[in-house]
């Protein structure tokens, strides 16, 4: 559509411009006046004069081009037509002039003949002398006002030449922007035809579309049956749970008082037996180590203090005792989040989560940890990438990431940017951009500017995760557009 | 030093809306989270929500949704919280604050609060 | 939600004397995310102590914070005329932010 209205404005500038260029030629020529003084009598010629005023206020006449002249040339014509019946008329009044005098003479002869006296004939040989001496002069005047009306004929004629050979080169370039015009048009229509081939492709894309649309809706509202389903059964297995707990209660109770029995009985018997210490563990290791070599969630204790936080342990990958810091499985919890969220961590520990990076910072620096990234395809192939050092700096320095010796079959090259970038949030921009890489992308991680990967990126199911700037990326194993289906970020001492 | 302005009292009508500002000075406005606390005499403090300007996000107590609506304006520097469907209930002083996105030393600046009337 | 409870609601001090107040959670706090306000009557609440233990600038050193998980205290070691106020605490544990329901000190 812009190409087509560009092509047309474009048109009728090359056309004005041409016009321009004529009227300025015309101009130059310009109002010429001759004056001829011969004795008491003067002659003024006014040649015609180009009238640039009365052109038509259009730039360009539509019917020009079929002319054999512009307008312009036309008044010339007019004119000159005019001029050659004020001379043809000039040259009547001078004949006629003659044929008077010629008659005054005769009259003036023949009264003379009548009433002449002899001794009046010198007399009248000298008025007859004067006569034929004014008629002489008469007749020079003549010629020579002739000879000027030739002079200004002879001039016309040189400029209606000059503008004859003007017009034929305007007549050339109209017929050249014709041309012009009509490339141009049948450019335009062929645009048109793939304008409305496009528009006809739309539709049809629209259709399609609408189709999902409807689709969707039918899938949104089985979901919406199931999901009243599943709350009824929720309801249900709640029910169960409450009385479930209340058992599990009153077995506890059950138990401490058989504890509490056992270790009277046992302090009667041996005083010096302290309380037994409560066991907390800084990473799954530490869990695998003490005998829980079955996967699951554990509680893990901070270093050097006593707060606690709730971590997913794998037991069984590679050897067991990795503490899970990421997982995406379902895009079931939002990854959008604040920094506050982020250092202390979101989600389900059995399902889809984030540590914390506060926990995982102080964790890190206590001793030497390894870093494991399981990623998994739509196609149902996995890979990984294994650190061999890996650390993040505390809060003050943003919690940067700092990774060495990788390995694996997720890329050769690291995608996460070394040397190590700052943690960014949605309300906490440290990246490298000039944008705010967290709110494009989405999700909390350590962008570059903006980097080969981002696990905590909008999550996309089967066939809708390709071309997707904003999706869970890993740029070394799928390339940038590609949304995987499942990532899991592992960590274990290095010397485990 | 930062400031918070915030606009003045309000006596309205039940059943009614009221949309009250809160303009901050001396700070990067994008950069800070406003967060909006209500006071009712013998009732303390309640955190209503809280929203960051640099990217219009929001957080809200899931008590004040469909009541409070936060917005800002960053080319004044300014947030807003409307509320909506009145009642008695909602007569209380409101207070906008500041913190950070780390959040580290809490609500760390204060408007002065706009009182709400609800009265027939 | 996580519910933070003051204790005790009102209390009476003497000039001089020290008072503590406590402020317990439902569900464990992160240190760094336990806050102290202090409002006096017909003013807006300003801060006092955040993350558990620093004090906020200005704030006297008469005023001390402590405390870990679910259990928090604030400490002023010789009580002044101008301490006379509602101290507040508040938490972030995940949203929504909650403060407790205050407690009231009187000077005698």
């Known amino acids: 559509m812009w190409q087509i209205v560009f092509f047309t404005l474009s048109c009728d500038l090359v056309l004005a411009a041409a016009y321009n260029n004529f009227r300025k030629s015309m101009d130059s020529i310009g109002k010429k006046q001759y004056q001829v003084q011969h004795g008491s009598c003067s002659y003024t010629f006014l040649l015609p004069e180009m009238d640039n005023c009365r052109s038509s206020s259009s730039p360009y006449v539509s019917n020009a081009v079929q002319r054999d002249a512009p307008l312009e040339y036309d008044d010339s014509v007019q004119r000159l037509q005019v001029l050659e019946n004020i001379m043809e008329n000039n040259t009547q009044w001078l004949m006629k002039l003659e044929n008077y005098i010629q008659d005054n003479m005769k009259k003036e002869m023949v009264e003379i003949q009548q009433n002449a006296v002899q001794n009046q004939t010198a007399v009248m040989i000298e008025i007859g002398t004067n006569l034929l001496n004014q008629t002489a002069e008469q007749t020079r005047k003549l010629t020579d006002v002739e000879a000027q009306v030739l002079n200004q004929t002879t001039r016309l004629e040189l400029q209606l030449l000059e503008h004859s050979l003007s017009t034929n080169k305007l007549e050339k370039q109209i017929l050249d922007q014709t041309s012009e015009i009509n490339k141009l048009q049948d450019k335009n229509s062929f645009l048109e035809k793939k304008v409305l081939a496009m528009e006809d492709k739309h539709i049809i894309q629209l259709q399609s579309i609408k189709e999902e649309k409807d689709q969707l809706q039918v899938l949104v509202s089985k979901q919406n049956s199931i999901i009243e389903e599943l709350e009824k059964k929720i309801v249900t297995a709640t029910v169960n749970n409450s009385v479930l707990q209340k058992q599990q209660h009153d077995l506890m109770e059950t138990v401490n008082n058989l504890l509490t029995m056992m270790s009277t009985s046992n302090s009667a018997k041996d005083p010096t037996v302290a309380k037994e210490e409560q066991i907390s563990f800084r990473d799954c290791a530490e869990v695998f180590k003490s005998g829980h070599t079955t996967n699951g969630i554990y509680t893990l204790t901070f270093p050097n203090s006593t707060e606690e936080i709730k971590a997913y342990c794998d037991m069984e990958a590679g050897g067991g005792g990795w503490t899970i810091i990421q997982r995406r499985e379902d895009g079931s919890v939002d990854f959008q989040r604040t920094w506050k969220e982020y250092k202390v961590g979101f989600g389900n520990p059995s399902g889809e989560y984030w540590l914390g990076n506060e926990f995982v910072s102080q964790l890190t620096n206590q001793q030497r940890y390894v870093l494991k990234i399981h990623l998994k395809d739509w196609e149902g192939n996995e890979a990984y990438s294994l650190y061999e050092h890996f650390y993040l700096s505390s809060e003050e320095l943003n919690y940067r990431i700092h990774l060495k010796g990788l390995t694996g079959t997720a890329g050769k090259i690291s995608s996460i940017s070394q040397p190590g970038n700052d943690f960014s949030t949605k309300d906490g921009d440290n990246d490298k951009c000039i944008c705010k890489c967290s709110q494009m992308l989405t999700g909390g991680w350590w962008f570059d500017a903006c980097g080969p990967s981002n696990l905590n990126g909008m999550y996309y199911p089967q066939r809708q995760n390709t071309n997707k700037f904003n999706g869970i990326k890993w740029y070394y194993w799928k390339g940038s557009g590609y949304s995987l289906k499942a990532t899991t970020m592992m960590i274990r001492p290095a010397d485990f | 030093q930062v400031q918070l302005q915030q606009s003045g009292a309000e006596l309205v009508r039940p059943g009614t809306s009221v949309k009250m500002s809160c303009k901050a000075a001396?700070?990067?406005?994008?950069?800070?989270?406003i967060g909006w606390v209500k006071q009712r005499p013998g009732h303390g403090l309640e955190w209503i929500g809280d929203?960051?300007?640099?990217?219009?996000?929001?957080n809200c107590n899931e008590k004040f949704k469909g009541k409070a609506t936060l917005t800002a304006d960053t080319s004044s520097s300014t947030a807003y919280m409307q509320l909506s469907s009145l009642t008695s209930e909602d007569s209380a002083i409101y207070y906008c604050s500041r913190s950070d996105y780390r959040n580290d030393e809490g609500f760390a600046d204060w408007g002065q609060g706009t009182l709400v009337t609800v009265s027939a | 939600e996580n519910v933070l409870t003051q204790s005790p609601a009102i209390m009476t001090a003497s000039l001089g004397q020290k008072v503590t107040m406590t402020c317990s959670a439902s569900?464990?706090?992160?240190?760094?995310?336990l806050h102290w306000y202090q409002q006096k009557s017909g003013a807006s609440p300003k801060p006092l102590i955040h993350r558990t233990s620093n004090l906020a600038s200005g704030v006297p050193a008469r005023f001390s914070g402590s405390g870990s998980g679910t259990s928090y205290s604030l400490t002023i070691s010789s009580v002044e005329a101008e301490d006379d106020a509602t101290y507040y605490c508040q938490q972030w544990s995940g949203y929504p932010y909650t403060f407790g329901g205050g407690t009231k000190l009187e000077i005698k």
């Open positions: 569900s464990s706090v992160s240190s760094s995310y």
């Open positions: 001396g700070y990067t406005f994008t950069d800070y989270w």
């Open positions: 929203i960051y300007p640099g990217g219009g996000y929001t």
